[in-house]
């Protein structure tokens, strides 16, 4: 499979935390009553890490099944396993639900790579380390696959939580958290905390490892160091957001911001790299490369493909530079910047080679779709969707990856001006809704 | 063209550091085009992967050797060096150096070999 | 750790026959291994690498296939200077470390 393409990816198993929580620098009061604060019950409650994404427990039906599900805010489906497959420990099994709805009506997904289609339902659902209730839903029970399920991983499904525009097949299937902000009291937002293990996990230790926080309907204090900074969500669909400068080792990739964003620029916690437009690919991988000439590392290992190995504890992070994007701000020309270490965007990889050594792959990659910010970005920060204020936060992630020497780091303000001009604007045709 | 010569002791005894040096000629071991590499081969048997240096001193070590290798280079002579400590009758092996190119991945250009004995 | 399992230890063969070896990979390489040919008493020689792609100065009747865990060196008619032992080599995990342990092709 290519490396940071879209779902599926492989999740890990379950347990005790990753990385030790660091203290919060500021303690500011909270912008609004019940907003803020702790969600104890929420916290934890994410399984996997970065190559293979993260699953929550969801529970579907009466009475209920227990599935775990990918988080996913790269798209909008709430999509299930719903029949045996040879990767599949469990399914929903619809006929032992006595509040299943059929909406008489198909559905199909293609990927790149793969596909899954179903058939459109609703059934009443919960997250039993989420917000104490429950909603009716529509859900796709996942009847055919192909290259969606992987082999070994533990988790049966998918929930997409971006905006009704992507849905499939229309915008008229209305999204999970749409349904559970309409149907509930819970806040329109969730936040995401996804700890990277910055090492590789064998089977054993994924059993024990854990994978982060979904925060639904809040932001949680002890999750997060430093400030919260905002960027505006662009357009409703995907969480799109805009790029206004890159730099690497503080230095100036120097491009016309367009560029970072064509022909969009998003965050997604259900791919795994961080995805850049060919042209700013090829620049950044240069700089990088430049930055790291001590060392020479094989096309193959810019690519995504090769892995590179360093006797165990040796890795010399040091080489590899640091790498800062910079957001468009709230307020007008300022902008505030994301700084992610070597730690995030070396993906470690295990059962290659020896125990005796520490093996990684390149996790920045090409695409022809836009800038897509993924789990190498996220775990470095806690990232709050604000769908209610229509922006996404960034702080850095009190268990994110670093050595003694740099930190991910959230930083701003910055004058930067004209950054409406950083934004691509789609061409719409008659035909672009008809196109899958 | 270039080419590849190993030399150093043919005899090693129990205990102590092998010490073997590779002479590049015919073109610059500075080339950023390419790493150096050390690879073995005990009598009757298959070929393993030692290390690897770059110009710049940076280096890469089979883990399996446990801390005993040291691969430096000498860019002013045009040579790479071996140096094997704490090495036992199971080091006795023809020892190779060679270029890694093909973009760093292939070892495309050998030297003759040497065979060095550990014995007392 | 990946391991190169080559097959079969030993070929018989006479000259102007077709040979074919085998080299598994433990689990993907894709397609980052190498073959090498090496004659008694001299050093190995870059035959193919990146599994299809000839080295320089390699005769045409040498080829290589496969990606993934299997991979194929295919000696289309072997000529007498052809007998030798033949290795693979896996680049995946980079620096490239694990060789196969080696075919032995002979006169019949």
């Known amino acids: 499979t290519q490396h940071g393409i879209r779902l599926p990816l492989r999740s890990g198993l379950g347990g005790a935390p990753l990385g030790l929580r660091l203290p919060r620098e500021t303690d500011e009061e909270p912008e609004e009553p019940g907003r803020r604060g702790s969600f104890v019950e929420m916290v934890d409650n994410l399984r996997g890490k970065s190559g293979q994404g993260y699953y929550v427990e969801m529970t579907v039906g009466s009475p209920p099944q227990t599935l775990n599900i990918l988080v996913d805010t790269g798209s909008s489906n709430f999509a299930v396993g719903a029949a045996p497959h040879p990767f599949l420990h469990r399914y929903y099994q619809r006929q032992l639900s006595s509040t299943y709805r059929d909406l008489r009506k198909g559905v199909y997904v293609p990927y790149t790579q793969g596909k899954w289609e179903g058939e459109l339902g609703t059934d009443l659902v919960s997250i039993p380390h989420g917000p104490n209730v429950t909603v009716r839903a529509n859900i796709a029970a996942i009847t055919e696959s192909d290259k969606f399920f992987i082999n070994g991983s533990n988790w049966e499904g998918i929930l997409g939580l971006a905006y009704a525009e992507i849905a499939r097949p229309d915008d008229s299937l209305e999204p999970f958290f749409d349904s559970l902000v309409k149907q509930t009291h819970v806040p329109n937002l969730f936040s995401l905390q996804l700890c990277g293990a910055g090492f590789p996990l064998n089977q054993s230790e994924v059993l024990a490892s854990v994978g982060g926080s979904m925060i639904i309907g809040g932001i949680d204090h002890s999750l997060y160091t430093g400030s919260l900074w905002y960027t505006p969500i662009r357009r409703e669909w995907y969480y799109e957001v805009i790029i206004v400068r890159v730099e690497i080792n503080g230095q100036d990739l120097k491009m016309d911001c367009k560029e970072y964003n064509y022909d969009k620029s998003i965050v997604d916690s259900g791919t795994t790299n961080l995805r850049l437009p060919k042209k700013v690919f090829e620049a950044a991988v240069k700089s990088i490369k430049a930055a790291s000439s001590t060392e020479k590392f094989p096309d193959g290992f810019w690519l995504g493909e090769q892995l590179v190995c360093w006797q165990a504890g040796t890795t010399p992070w040091n080489i590899f530079p640091v790498i800062s994007l910079y957001l468009m701000g709230e307020v007008t020309n300022q902008s505030f910047r994301i700084t992610i270490l070597p730690q995030q965007y070396l993906r470690p990889v295990e059962d290659v080679a020896t125990s005796q050594d520490d093996c990684y792959k390149f996790a920045i990659s090409q695409s022809s779709t836009g800038t897509v910010m993924g789990a190498v970005i996220m775990e470095g920060f806690y990232v709050v969707f604000d769908r209610a204020r229509k922006r996404i936060g960034f702080a850095v992630s009190a268990c994110h990856v670093h050595d003694e020497f740099r930190t991910a780091a959230v930083e701003g303000p910055f004058v930067t001006l004209d950054m409406e001009d950083c934004g691509y604007n789609i061409p719409q045709t008659d035909e672009s809704t008809l196109m899958t | 063209q270039l080419q590849l010569q190993e030399s150093g002791p043919g005899l090693v005894k129990p205990s102590e550091t092998l010490s073997l040096t590779c002479t590049v000629s015919?073109?610059?071991?500075?080339?950023?085009?390419?790493?150096w590499g050390w690879i073995r081969q005990p009598p009757g048997k298959g070929l393993e992967w030692i290390g690897n240096?770059?110009?710049?001193?940076?280096?890469y070590y089979n883990p399996s050797l446990k801390g005993r290798v040291t691969i430096s280079v000498d860019t002013s002579k045009n040579q790479f060096s071996l140096k094997l400590s704490s090495v036992t009758a199971a080091d006795t092996a023809v020892y190779y150096c060679?270029?890694?190119?093909?973009?760093?991945?292939?070892?495309?250009?050998w030297g003759r070999g040497t065979l060095v004995t550990v014995s007392s | 750790e990946i391991v190169l399992t080559q097959s079969p230890a030993t070929l018989s063969l006479s000259p102007g026959e077709r040979a074919t070896l085998s080299c598994r990979a433990s689990?993907?390489?894709?397609?980052?291994l190498a073959w090498f040919q090496q004659k008694p008493g001299q050093a190995p020689r870059l035959l193919i690498y990146?599994?299809?792609n000839r080295a320089t100065g390699i005769p045409a009747r040498f080829s290589g296939s496969g990606s993934g865990t299997d991979f194929t060196l295919t000696i289309s008619s072997l000529e007498p200077e052809d007998f030798a032992v033949y290795y693979c080599?896996?680049?995946?995990?980079?620096?490239?470390?694990?060789f196969g342990g080696g075919t032995k092709v002979e006169i019949k």
């Open positions: 240096i770059y110009y710049s001193g940076s280096t």
């Open positions: 060679a270029r890694l190119g093909h973009g760093y991945n292939y070892f495309d250009l």
């Open positions: 080599q896996q680049v995946y995990v980079w620096p490239p470390r694990t």
């Open positions: 015919g073109g610059s071991i500075s080339s950023s085009s390419y790493y």
């Open positions: 990146d599994a299809s």
């Open positions: 689990q993907s390489v894709s397609s980052y």
